[in-house]
């Protein structure tokens, strides 16, 4: 899948992870989108 | 010891496209995201998207998603970002660099000049 | 997107001296600053993340702080090989963003 970003922001976004996508591991399925 | 190295610079016209590869070793090339900056001549650092080597997940800064395919060869640990109809203004030096989630960019490889001139 | 203003944008100073470059983020962006280094011809190297953890291999005279929309990069004695550009560089959602830069000369 794809993702776009730029254009919005997450106003939910945790103060204490990153949102950026996890490192892939063989279980991941959409990391990204 | 982690190593991304980039194919050789491209010299193309306006309307071309180029792709540019990227080789990984010392690590395992599926456990991390391969990102992708450019910096023009002069100027500052450019994210311009990201792969999951796995699933192949994509995710783009909007300014190139139209132009921009990010591919890769997990069998030869291998990146590709194809930038299409290439203007003056995407003549930079493309970076290919390996995304840690906690870590962010921490490996670069060497650049690959791409110069867009009629 | 999130925009991040370093300042100054140029910065001279001596062998020796201590620095200090700093990083305003346009909204949180938590602990998530990263700052990397660039030499002329050279890719980035990455020196600082999540807002002070020092990369592996990097000096300790390089020193990060700061959280929320405030980040700085501190080096605490100058080496001639420590003259270069510096980004810092948000990590906490998408889109990747980077500010413009920080050149540091010799005076």
């Known amino acids: 899948s794809e993702t776009t970003t730029g254009t919005s922001s997450n106003s939910s976004q945790s103060t204490s992870n990153s949102g950026l996508a996890p490192n892939p591991t063989n279980a991941t399925t959409k990391a990204a989108g | 010891q982690v190593q991304l190295v980039q194919s050789g610079a491209e010299v193309k016209k306006p309307g071309a496209s180029v792709k540019v590869s990227c080789k990984a070793s010392g690590y395992d090339f599926t456990g991390y995201h391969m990102g992708w900056v450019r910096q023009a001549p002069g100027q500052g650092l450019e994210w311009m998207g990201e792969i999951n080597p796995i699933t192949s997940d994509k995710t783009f800064n909007q300014k190139f998603k139209s132009r921009v395919t990010m591919t890769r060869d997990t069998s030869i640990s291998t990146a590709y970002m194809e930038l299409s109809r290439l203007r003056s203004d995407d003549t930079a030096v493309y970076y290919c660099?390996?995304?840690?989630?906690?870590?962010?960019?921490?490996?670069w490889g060497q650049g690959t000049t791409v110069t867009v001139s009629s | 997107d999130i925009q991040l203003t370093q300042s100054p944008s140029f910065l001279s100073a001596s062998v020796g001296d201590r620095v200090t470059i700093t990083c305003r983020a346009s909204?949180?962006?938590?602990?998530?600053g990263a700052w990397y280094q660039q030499k002329p011809g050279k890719a980035p190297k990455l020196l600082i993340y999540a807002g002070s953890t020092l990369h592996s291999g990097i000096p300790s005279r390089f020193r990060g702080s700061g959280s929320g929309t405030e980040f700085t990069l501190t080096i605490s004695s100058l080496q001639p090989e420590d003259f270069a550009t510096y980004y810092c560089q948000q990590h906490n959602e998408y889109p990747i963003i980077f500010g413009q830069g920080t050149k540091l000369e010799i005076k």
């Open positions: 660099a390996r995304r840690d989630y906690g870590t962010s960019l921490d490996y």
């Open positions: 909204k949180s962006i938590s602990k998530y």
